[in-house]
């Protein structure tokens, strides 16, 4: 047996007209410490009883996990990245078998020089992180490598990374056109074969705050939306105050239901309120009470 401790109630009338009484403090708790009856059924919406209270699943909260939160935590990554798979042909170095072995001194030296050269090429790109050689093969030296780009997460991160990949393409095309061998000699740090430059593939971090918000909102996905504040995404229902999409319930309380957000209007000693936004107040007629 579970006893409910009596609490003061506030009378709320839904915008459809029915009066609802809700506890103004949430202290409906078991009196006895022994587990009696099926505690599992007490936790709704997939919540589970941990022996003391209901552990609720997103987006629910409350004593029995019967209420829907106004906002859901979504955490975009600190940084987002792109990886470009490129191939360039270095003509100023002749391929030797030692270059196949990534732990050889020759490979390490080539890697160092190639990295230095690419750092110079991409020096003006703020998103540029570095290069990673994946394979070296004959011809003179065909260098298969990744160009790594990274930027801080903002709502426009895709545009920033797309722009950076375009600049990478322009810069590598320029250097492999300009730094070429003359009379079998190279005056630059490295020389290239102009026709050997190819962009194989571009992979960009995929993060969609709207998708994460919808997933976490589950059956309320149509009513939760993403709004930005200081470039940070917030997953909110219209019941969360302080956002453009916030519902103003005036003289009432916003509550989420499976049909969306609705206002539960209050009734005070002097007025009752109605309307979709609880903004229509009607004064109660004055009755004299005799004591």
């Amino acid at each position: 047996p579970l006893a409910t401790i009596p609490v003061s109630t506030t009378s709320l009338t839904s915008s459809e007209g029915s009066t609802i009484s809700t506890p103004s403090v949430d202290i409906s708790t078991p009196v006895t410490t022994s587990i009696v009856g099926d505690q599992c059924s007490r936790c709704k919406n997939g919540g589970f009883w941990d022996g003391l209270k209901c552990q609720c699943l997103t987006p629910y909260y409350g004593e029995s996990c019967e209420e829907v939160v106004n906002s859901i935590d979504i955490a975009p990554p600190e940084t987002v990245s792109a990886q470009m798979e490129l191939t360039v042909t270095v003509t100023s170095v002749k391929f030797t078998d030692e270059l196949k072995n990534h732990s050889s001194q020759e490979f390490r030296e080539f890697n160092k020089t190639f990295t230095e050269q690419m750092n110079i090429v991409y020096s003006g790109i703020p998103e540029y992180v570095g290069v990673n050689i994946t394979n070296l093969r004959l011809g003179s030296v065909v260098v298969e490598h990744d160009v790594l780009l990274r930027t801080k997460y903002t709502p426009e991160y895709k545009t920033a990374l797309d722009n950076a990949t375009e600049v990478v393409k322009q810069k590598i095309t320029k250097v492999t056109t300009e730094q070429i061998m003359t009379n079998d000699n190279c005056s630059a740090l490295m020389c290239f074969n102009t026709t050997g430059t190819q962009v194989q593939n571009i992979t960009v971090t995929q993060y969609d705050p709207v998708e994460e918000c919808r997933q976490k909102a589950e059956e309320y996905e149509d009513y939760f939306l993403v709004e930005y504040r200081d470039q940070k995404p917030y997953c909110i229902s219209p019941c969360e105050s302080g956002f453009n999409a916030s519902k103003n319930c005036n003289h009432g309380k916003c509550q989420m239901s499976q049909n969306g957000a609705r206002c539960l209007c209050v009734t005070t000693e002097t007025h009752w309120y109605s309307g979709e936004d609880c903004n229509q107040g009607t004064q109660k007629s004055h009755h004299h009470h005799h004591h």
Partner: nanobody
């Protein structure tokens, strides 16, 4: 650890000859590229000549026909025979090496360097 030590520098009259040597230790002389660079006072370091592991050589235009680069793999040594020396050849001469088969006289491509030997051409 790779160590390169130059010798053979000195004072010589215009039209004279000098032979520079570079002893390489810790460097597999049968591989990669060895080169001579020079730096005149107040000027940038410039490539003089380089030689690859297969004996392929290349020279700066200013020294072609006068200087000869060679290497002795058995002795782990590099040489620069300088004939018909001119006043403008006055500089500190450096030996440099790379484990890679390079076709460049860009100094940044060579990770290993000697301390240099001074060559002065003056009457």
């Amino acid at each position: 650890d790779v160590q390169l030590v130059e010798s053979g520098g000195g004072l010589v009259q215009p039209g004279g000859s000098l032979r520079l040597s570079c002893a390489a230790s810790g460097f597999p002389s049968s591989r990669g590229t060895m080169a001579w660079f020079r730096q005149a006072p107040g000027k940038e370091r410039e490539g003089v000549a380089f030689i690859n592991s297969d004996g392929r050589t290349s020279y700066a235009e200013s020294v072609k026909g006068r200087f000869t680069i060679s290497r002795d793999n058995a002795k782990n040594s590099l040489y620069l025979q300088m004939n018909s020396l001119r006043a403008e050849d006055t500089a500190v001469y450096y030996c440099a090496a790379s484990l890679l088969y390079l076709m460049t006289v860009n100094a940044a491509a060579y990770p290993y360097w000697g301390q240099g030997t001074m060559v002065t051409v003056s009457s």
